[in-house]
Interface confidence: medium
C-alpha cells in the first residue's frame, strides 16, 4: 500500500484492546480545503516506540488503515480511496510494547466535516439571574453549532458543561457564576448535527470576577491640618488582591476589581456638590471639614460592598482670626481673604448639637477688601446666630465651590450669640472678707467661659464711695475670685464685675455695697476684759470686805439658805467667748479687726452674700475712732 | 493678568541634559498646582509631568518617569522641568500649564506659549 | 494609562452648522474630562471642564455632556474663529491623557 493510500488489507499487528486507561483519544477528521482532510488525535502515556494506524470502514463494511508512525496528525485527499461523501466510520489503533490500544470511534461525513473555530474576538460578559452570560459573534459561514465551556477556580480542576446547540449569527452560553471566587472559562464548537465531527480548539481564557467584588481592606490616615486649611487623605494598606486561576494570572481583562474613593463632605451642606468619586489612586487634599470616605469595590458586574470611614472636623480652632462686630443694622464678620474670586462657606452651629445639621451661607464669589480681609453680614431679623448660646463658627474657602476636593478651612472659632454683652454678665456677685484690710470677691463663671477663646477677660471695679475714686482689675477668664486690698474701715464701697471679649465689652453686674467697721483687735479686748474683770474683782473683794466688817458689826448672823432659789441663775447654755490672740505680740497695740457690712438699694436682688464674722458670741465692737487710708490709696486686688 | 512664560528650550543631543523653566506671574503661585504638556510637531498634546502647590506631590507620565524632574521654588514663582537621557522622540514644543487650584487635576486653565526642545545628534 | 479615542479626526463643516465631536476613554472616567482648542503655533486653550462646565470667557455656544466613558463636544453653531483642532483630556487618573485630537475645517 502506497503512504498516501488508505490500505485495505489487514494491520500489521494483532486485535486491539481498548480497555487500557492510556492510548489515543480525542480523535477529531475534518476538511481542511475543497479535497483536502485531516484527521488528529491525542495519545495518552509514553510515546517511545510506539506506531499509530488511523482505521475507517465505510459503509459497505470494507475498512482500511493509514500507518502515520509516531506521528498523530494526518492529512489525506479525496483520492485516498476513503469516500468523503458518504458516512465512515474511523478510529485509532496505537501499536506499541506488543500491545494494541484502541481510541473511541467517530463516524462522520468527511465532506461536510468542516474544521470549527472557537468563539473569536470579543466574548461579551453578563450576568442574568444569577447567572453567567457570554455572547460572542459566531465565525464566518459557521451558522449551527454544538457548544461546550469549560471552566475552573484557583483551587478546583477543569469542569466540562454543555451550552446546547446555536443557530445564530450571534451564539451565546449560560454558565454557573461564582459568588466569590474568580473563574477562568474556555469555550469550544463543532458543526450541528454531527455527532461524530470535531470539536474546535479551546478559545482563549475568558476571565470572569466573583458576582461580590471583594470587600475592600484598607485604612487611612490624616495628616494634620496645615497653615493653607487642607490636610492630606492617605492610604495605609492597599486592597488585598483576588486570587486568580491560572489562565488568568496574566493580563487577562475581566477579573479586575476598580477600588473607588467616594467622598461625603457633611460640614458647609448649602455648598452645590457634597459627593465626588475619584480612583483610589489619587488620593485627596481635604479640608478641616468632617468627612465619610466610602471605598467602593467593583468589577465587570458592577459596585460590591463598600466600607464607609468616618473623618471627624478638625478641631484646631484660631481664636483671634476671626473679627465680629456688632451694629444696629447686624453683625459683620471679618477674616484675612484668600485669592481673588473666593467663595466662602461660613458654617455655625451651637456648642453641644455637633449631631445636628450646621446651618450654613454661601457668599457669592468675593475679593480681598484694601485691608485684605474677606466679609461676611448679617441682620438681625434673619436670626443667625441670635440665640443667647456658644456657637461653633468654621469657614471655609474655594475658588472653585462645585470641586468637593477644593475646599479649604480659612479658620475655626467661637462666638456667642445674641446680646452677649448682656448675657455674659457675671450673676452671684459676693464679697467675703479675707484680711484686716481686703476683701474676697467672687462670681459665678460667665456664660461666655462656655465658649473656648470667646471670654477675653473679667474686670472687677471698685468704687470708695467717699472719694467717688474708681479702680478696675482686670482678671485672667479662668479665675472668678479677686482679692481687693488696702481697703479703709468705715468706707463705703461697692464693686461690680463684667466679662470682656475681644471685641465687645461687657455689662457691669449689679452694684455691691459694702464697708468695713474698725474693730478692736483681740489683744484689746482681753486685756479690757482682764481689766475690768480684775477691778470688779477688786472692787468686789474690798466692799465684800468693807460690807462684812459692816455687818458684823450691824446685823446679827442669819441661818443658811438651803431651800432658797432666790439667788440661783437661770439655766441656760450662755457661754462666753473670748477672742483669742493669734499670735503673742509684744507691744499690745490697738488693732483694727474687719468686719465686712453688705447693703444694697432697695428694688435691687438680693444675692446670697456672706457677711464676715467674728466668732459666735463675740461682742462687735464699733470704735469712735475713724482710721483713714492715706490720700491717694485706693481698693487693691489681690488675685 | 495670569502670564505663564517658558524658556530653556533648544538643540540638544541624545543622551543629554536639559531644564526648562515657566516664570509665572499674576496670580498666587503658590496656590496652584502647575504641570508640563509637550506637543510633538504636528501631532497631538502629550502631558508630561504635573506637581502640587506645595511640591509635595508630583506625577509623571510613563514614556518619561525616570528621567525627567518636575519642581517648582515657590520663592521666585517659577516651576522647572529637569530632562536628562533626552532621547529624539523627546522633540516637542513643551508648554507649561496651570491647574485651576492646588492639585495638578481639573484640566488647566492657563497656558504658556511653549518652547520647543529638538533632540538630534 | 486611560486610552481617549475622539472621534471623527477630521471634519469639514461650514459656519452655523452644528458639529459634535465625540470622546471615549477606555474605562469610566466620572465626569472628570476637559476639552481644549488649539489653533495652528498657539497654547491650547481651556473650554469645558467637569465633561460639562463651561470655563469662563467661553461663548455658550460651546456645551459638553457625557459621563463615564463616552462624552461629547457640541458646537450648536458654528463661528469662522471656531475652526482649529479639539482635544479631550481625561484627568481621573494619572497619568492624565489626551485624545489625538479633532481638525474642524472650513468646508
Known amino acids: 500500500c502506497g503512504t498516501s493510500e488508505c490500505c485495505f488489507q489487514d494491520p500489521p499487528y494483532s486485535d486491539a484492546d481498548s480497555g487500557s486507561a492510556s492510548g489515543p483519544r480525542d480523535l477529531s477528521c475534518y476538511r481542511i480545503s475543497s479535497a483536502g482532510y485531516e484527521c488528529s488525535w491525542q495519545y495518552e502515556g509514553p510515546t517511545a516506540g510506539v506506531s499509530h494506524f488511523l482505521r475507517c470502514c465505510l459503509s459497505s463494511g470494507r475498512c482500511c488503515y493509514f500507518a502515520t508512525g509516531s506521528a498523530t496528525r494526518l492529512q489525506f485527499s479525496d483520492q485516498a480511496g476513503v469516500s468523503v461523501l458518504h458516512t465512515v466510520t474511523l478510529w485509532v489503533e496505537s501499536w506499541a510494547r506488543n500491545r494494541t490500544e484502541k481510541s473511541p470511534e467517530v463516524t462522520l461525513q468527511l465532506y461536510k466535516s468542516v474544521k470549527y473555530k472557537p468563539p473569536l474576538g470579543d466574548i461579551k460578559v453578563s450576568k442574568l439571574a444569577g447567572q453567567l452570560r457570554m455572547e460572542w459573534e459566531t465565525p464566518d459561514n459557521q451558522v449551527g453549532a454544538e457548544v461546550q465551556f469549560r471552566h475552573r477556580t484557583p483551587s478546583s480542576s477543569w469542569k466540562l458543561g454543555d451550552c446546547g446547540p446555536q443557530d445564530d449569527d450571534t451564539e451565546s452560553c449560560l454558565c454557573p457564576l461564582e459568588m466569590n471566587v474568580a473563574q477562568e472559562f474556555q469555550l469550544r464548537r463543532r458543526r450541528l448535527g454531527s455527532q461524530g465531527s470535531s470539536w474546535s480548539k479551546w478559545s482563549s481564557p475568558v476571565c470572569v470576577p466573583p458576582e461580590n467584588p471583594p470587600q475592600p481592606q484598607v485604612r487611612f490616615s490624616v495628616e494634620q491640618l496645615g497653615r493653607d486649611g487642607r490636610r492630606r487623605l492617605t492610604l495605609k494598606e492597599q486592597p488585598t488582591q483576588l486570587e486568580l486561576p491560572e489562565g488568568c494570572q496574566g493580563p487577562a481583562p475581566g477579573v479586575e476589581v476598580t477600588y473607588q474613593l467616594q467622598l461625603h463632605m457633611l460640614s458647609c451642606p448649602c455648598k452645590a456638590k457634597a459627593t465626588r468619586t475619584l480612583p483610589l489612586e489619587k488620593m485627596p487634599y481635604l479640608s478641616g471639614a468632617a468627612y465619610n470616605v466610602a471605598v467602593i469595590s467593583s468589577n465587570r458586574f458592577g459596585p460590591g460592598p463598600n466600607q464607609t470611614w468616618h473623618i471627624p472636623a478638625d478641631t484646631h480652632t484660631e481664636p483671634v482670626a476671626l473679627n465680629i462686630s456688632v451694629g444696629t443694622n447686624g453683625t459683620t464678620m471679618y477674616w484675612p481673604a484668600r485669592a481673588q474670586s473666593t467663595t466662602y462657606c461660613i458654617e455655625w452651629q451651637p456648642v453641644g448639637q455637633e449631631g445636628s445639621l450646621a446651618t450654613c451661607n454661601l457668599t457669592a464669589p468675593q475679593d480681598p477688601d484694601p485691608a485684605g480681609m474677606a466679609t461676611y453680614s448679617w441682620s438681625r431679623e434673619s436670626g443667625a446666630m441670635g440665640q443667647e448660646k456658644c456657637y461653633h463658627i468654621t469657614i471655609f474657602a474655594s475658588a472653585h465651590p462645585k470641586k468637593l476636593t477644593l475646599w479649604s478651612t480659612v479658620l475655626s472659632t467661637y462666638h456667642f450669640g445674641g446680646n452677649a454683652s448682656a448675657a455674659g454678665t457675671p450673676h452671684h456677685v459676693s464679697v467675703k472678707n479675707h484680711s484686716l484690710d481686703s476683701v474676697s470677691v467672687d462670681w459665678a463663671p460667665s456664660l461666655l467661659s462656655t465658649c473656648p477663646g470667646v471670654l477675653k477677660e473679667y474686670v472687677v471695679r471698685c468704687r470708695d464711695e467717699d472719694s467717688n475714686q474708681v479702680s478696675e482689675h482686670p482678671v485672667q477668664p479662668t479665675e472668678t475670685q479677686v482679692t481687693l486690698s488696702d481697703l479703709r474701715a468705715g468706707v463705703a464701697y461697692t464693686v461690680q464685675v463684667r466679662a470682656d471679649t475681644a471685641w465687645l465689652r461687657g455689662a457691669w453686674s449689679q452694684p455691691q455695697r459694702f464697708s468695713i467697721k474698725v474693730q478692736v483687735s483681740d489683744w484689746f479686748i482681753f486685756f479690757a476684759s482682764l481689766g475690768s474683770f480684775l477691778s470688779i474683782l477688786l472692787v468686789g473683794v474690798l466692799g465684800y470686805l468693807g460690807l462684812n466688817r459692816a455687818t458684823r458689826h450691824l446685823c446679827p448672823p442669819l441661818p443658811t439658805p438651803c431651800a432658797s432659789s432666790a439667788i440661783q441663775f437661770p439655766a441656760g447654755k450662755e457661754t462666753w467667748q473670748w477672742i483669742n490672740p493669734v499670735d503673742f505680740q509684744e507691744e499690745a497695740s490697738l488693732q483694727e479687726a474687719l468686719v465686712v457690712e453688705m447693703s444694697w438699694d432697695k428694688g435691687e436682688r438680693t444675692e446670697l452674700l456672706e457677711k464676715a464674722e467674728l466668732p459666735e458670741g463675740a461682742p462687735e465692737l464699733a470704735l469712735d475712732t475713724q482710721l483713714s487710708l492715706e490720700d491717694g490709696d485706693r481698693c487693691k486686688a489681690k488675685m | 493678568q495670569v502670564q505663564l512664560v517658558e524658556s530653556g528650550g533648544g538643540v540638544v543631543q541624545p543622551g543629554r541634559s536639559l531644564r526648562l523653566s515657566c516664570a509665572a506671574s499674576g496670580f498666587t503661585f503658590t496656590s496652584y498646582g502647575m504641570s508640563w504638556v509637550r506637543q510633538a510637531p504636528g501631532k497631538g498634546l502629550e502631558w508630561v509631568a504635573g506637581i502640587s502647590y506645595s511640591g509635595s506631590d508630583t506625577e509623571y507620565a510613563d514614556s518619561v518617569k525616570g528621567r525627567f524632574t518636575i519642581s517648582r521654588d515657590n520663592s521666585k514663582n517659577t516651576l522647572y522641568l529637569q530632562m536628562n537621557s533626552l532621547r529624539a522622540e523627546d522633540t516637542a514644543v513643551y508648554y507649561c500649564?496651570?491647574?485651576?487650584?492646588?492639585?495638578?487635576?481639573?484640566?488647566?486653565?492657563?497656558w504658556g506659549r511653549g518652547t520647543l526642545v529638538t533632540v538630534s545628534s | 494609562a486611560i486610552q481617549m479615542t475622539q472621534s471623527p479626526s477630521s471634519l469639514s463643516a461650514s459656519v452655523g452648522d452644528r458639529v459634535t465631536i465625540t470622546c471615549r476613554a477606555s474605562?469610566?472616567?466620572?465626569?472628570?474630562l476637559a476639552w481644549y482648542q488649539q489653533k495652528p503655533g498657539k497654547a491650547p486653550k481651556l473650554l469645558i471642564y467637569?465633561?460639562?462646565s463651561l470655563q469662563s470667557g467661553v461663548p455658550s455656544r460651546f456645551s459638553g455632556s457625557g459621563s463615564g466613558t463616552d462624552f461629547t463636544l457640541t458646537i450648536s453653531s458654528l463661528q469662522p474663529e471656531d475652526f482649529a483642532t479639539y482635544y479631550c483630556?481625561?484627568?481621573?487618573?494619572?497619568?492624565?491623557?489626551f485624545g489625538q485630537g479633532t481638525k474642524v475645517e472650513i468646508k
Open positions: 483630556q481625561q484627568y481621573w487618573i494619572y497619568p492624565f491623557t
Open positions: 474605562q469610566g472616567i466620572s465626569s472628570d
Open positions: 467637569d465633561a460639562s
Open positions: 500649564a496651570r491647574s485651576p487650584d492646588y492639585i495638578i487635576d481639573y484640566g488647566f486653565d492657563y
